[in-house]
């Protein structure tokens, strides 16, 4: 018996087609992805093949103005239109709190939403009961397939699930649910979830009875053969893991942003064992037509976005200096504003010992592309912020050793004075440079804000200590020459859309007046 699994993950509100790098589509003839194009390909495969499941491994939420405006209603609407069969909860599905998940998505989705390792307690338990499930048994042709969900247990540090949801260890939570499916005579089981490729592989290895793992969170690109675009494969598709009980378990993921549709063909024997598996992600490039009916619906929903872009988010009573002349040479107040917003967006008081789990922000000055003049009645709009942060990036959470941070700050000024983008703006950090010293030895003082303290204060950076830092995904991926970050980071979790972080902060503060306050000094 053959099953075709079509899968997406980490779509991050890319409902419209995007450029090849998943930013805003500029030249339509070269654009990719989007739900209208995805629908064309899904329908084509459904037409051709008998037993097809369309699955999503989480993080539909967060990433573009679509989510900012529609807050998840767009996800439910278009996933319903594409007739998804199941979805796993990702960490970003909790970005607007539990209510922001329940109302727009859980109550509106016409497909099961899954996670076996999230347990509700207190008053939430009855409110959310039945709105998401640990597993679902789906009829596919003449057979049944069990889908069991999982979500990153780090979600409380990455999003806003509140205090009434407990995120258990994935493997511990999955095993009893898979066992239950086995007792129900379900012998074909897919683990669908959002914990990253390393955990996907562990689940394949450790959870008895799981036949296939469809993952997300780490934006992993797997491919067999010559890859069709810029993404470099982390391994073959599917990635085969030998389980502890000796089975070959295919593990798949389909990069991110709706650029690819994962296509996995599995052959089962009559006892539900995987006999063979093969496939590849399908690049959704512009040679695949956008479905006109879905496209028309997208255009209808778009109207509200255009209106939103020009609405006032808040006010500034000072000039927001985002000029290259400032942000690539010295501390600039636009850099301070953005870093303060980044830290504010990551306030998670999860432990009595820590006032927060992260206190530091770094931001490449070259990523700040425009100032905002306060003389326009102080008004700040989404449109203004899109000029400051035009690349559609995210502000991510990483863990780095102090020694890596020191290297990063040395890199920040290694060729100072040439208006290059690597000069770092900061938050929760005090740095002093001496430019008379040779490159690689210019950081004379580097103090960081403590987290394990009731009264935050600045302490010298410790080389061997592991620190959490918020930074743009561009830096996490080694951009602007920050190869040491990419090479040495100990953990990387993708965060919220950059503009969304800053706009939310401005809306919250209502009136802003960031200053230049001595975060960066030259001796």
């Amino acid at each position: 018996w053959e099953l075709t699994i079509l899968h997406t993950n980490d779509v991050h509100s890319r409902l419209e087609q995007t450029s090849e790098d998943s930013s805003k589509c500029v030249n339509a003839s070269r654009c990719m992805g989007g739900v209208a194009r995805l629908f064309t390909k899904v329908q084509q495969i459904r037409r051709a093949e008998p037993n097809v499941l369309l699955l999503d491994a989480g993080d539909q939420y967060q990433g573009t103005i679509w989510f900012t405006v529609y807050k998840g209603a767009e996800v439910a609407h278009f996933m319903n239109a594409l007739r998804y069969d199941a979805m796993a909860l990702g960490n970003h599905e909790f970005d607007n709190g539990v209510e922001g998940l329940i109302e727009p998505l859980l109550k509106e989705a016409k497909f099961p939403i899954l996670s076996a390792n999230i347990k509700a307690k207190g008053p939430l338990a009855s409110q959310i009961s039945g709105l998401y499930l640990p597993y679902k048994v789906l009829p596919v042709g003449d057979e049944v397939v069990g889908i069991v969900g999982y979500t990153s247990k780090e979600t409380p540090f990455l999003s806003n699930p509140g205090t009434n949801l407990v995120f258990e260890d994935e493997i511990t939570a999955l095993q009893p649910e898979v066992d239950k499916l086995k007792t129900l005579n379900v012998n074909k089981i897919i683990a669908l979830g959002h914990s990253g490729f390393e955990m996907d592989k562990l689940i394949a290895q450790k959870v008895r009875g799981v036949d296939v793992v469809v993952g997300g969170h780490s934006n992993t690109f797997l491919y067999t053969g010559n890859p069709p675009s810029k993404e470099v494969p982390a391994g073959k598709y599917p990635f085969i893991v030998t389980s502890d009980d000796g089975r070959k378990v295919p593990v798949v993921q389909a990069y991110a942003f709706g650029k690819y549709l994962g296509y996995l063909k599995i052959e089962f024997d009559e006892r539900g064992n995987v006999i063979s598996s093969h496939g590849n992600p399908i690049l959704l490039n512009s040679s695949i037509p956008e479905d006109p009916s879905i496209k028309a619906d997208i255009n209808k929903w778009r109207i509200k976005l255009d209106n939103y872009s020009t609405q006032e988010l808040g006010k500034t009573i000072v000039y927001l200096d985002g000029s290259s002349q400032s942000c690539r040479f010295r501390e600039c107040n636009m850099g301070n504003l953005i870093c303060d917003a980044m830290i504010n967006n990551n306030l998670r008081h999860t432990d009595e010992m820590f006032w927060n789990h992260v206190s530091m922000c770094i931001l490449n000055g070259g990523g700040i592309r425009s100032p905002i003049d306060e003389r326009n009645n102080g008004t700040i709009t989404w449109e203004n912020l899109a000029a400051v942060l035009p690349f559609g990036g995210t502000f991510d959470l990483v863990q780095l050793k102090g020694s890596t941070l020191k290297k990063a700050f040395e890199h920040s000024v290694h060729r100072y004075g040439q208006s290059t983008g690597e000069f770092l703006q900061v938050g929760g950090i005090h740095v002093v440079y001496d430019l008379s010293r040779k490159p690689g030895d210019r950081v004379v003082k580097l103090d960081v804000l403590c987290t394990k303290c009731r009264v935050p204060s600045y302490d010298p950076l410790k080389m061997d200590e592991v620190y959490k830092v918020i930074l743009p995904n561009f830096l996490a991926n080694g951009g602007d020459g920050f190869q040491m970050i990419k090479d040495e980071l100990l953990r990387h979790d993708s965060g919220d859309q950059d503009i969304n972080v800053v706009s939310t902060y401005i809306s919250k503060m209502k009136v802003i007046y960031p200053a230049v306050e001595g975060r960066i000094k030259f001796s």
Partner: antibody, heavy 121, light 107 residues
Framework: QVQLVQSGAEVKKPGASVKVSCKAS????????LSWVRQATGQGLEWMGE????????YYNEKFKGRVTMTRNTSISTAYMELSSLRSEDTAVYYC??????????????WGAGTTVTVSS | DIQMTQSPSSLSASVGDRVTITCKAS??????VAWYQQKPGKAPKLLLY???YRYSGVPSRFSGSGSGTDYTLTISSLQPEDFATYYC?????????FGGGTKLEIK
Amino acid sequence: QVQLVQSGAEVKKPGASVKVSCKASGYTFTSYGLSWVRQATGQGLEWMGEIYPGSGNTYYNEKFKGRVTMTRNTSISTAYMELSSLRSEDTAVYYCARYDYLGSSYGFDYWGAGTTVTVSS
Amino acid sequence: DIQMTQSPSSLSASVGDRVTITCKASQDVSTAVAWYQQKPGKAPKLLLYSASYRYSGVPSRFSGSGSGTDYTLTISSLQPEDFATYYCQQHYNTPYTFGGGTKLEIK
């Protein structure tokens, strides 16, 4: 290399049936669609229908519904098109053509050489 | 059914000429248009797919454009081997339909 080899020419009487075969090689037979297209002498191309060998799913042009049957034998990578109740206007060259539904080339990328079917009393 | 109206039905041109063939669909076919070249006694050959994508091995003098209902095949500089009949086809909805063909002859 990809090849679609069709069966030889046929001469049939009106009211009879004809079954044309198309043997595929050089690719995974079950991972592509196969369409049948005909062309009367000096005329244009006319799509008759398609079969997806992996599933056996068929979709026919309404014009031929009830008269055309498309089948496949995956063990020998061969597709068949049977047309019944033949009439003189069915005299044409019949082509099988491959369609890559998993890729992005929206068109028929490989064609058989064609099978001439003559309907004459 | 979607009608594909191809024009002109025949065309005389010389080697080196630039030639344009158009195809109009009776409804939006969302760039799901292919162009084929056919020589007498032979099967058609795929030239372009998805309106503007050249199929592998097809010379760069062949190009395509269009969206919605209007599509164009252009041969920038005719070569002797280009004299043949050209067909457009919509692959958007079944039944997939072809244009009536354009016979390109030597002037």
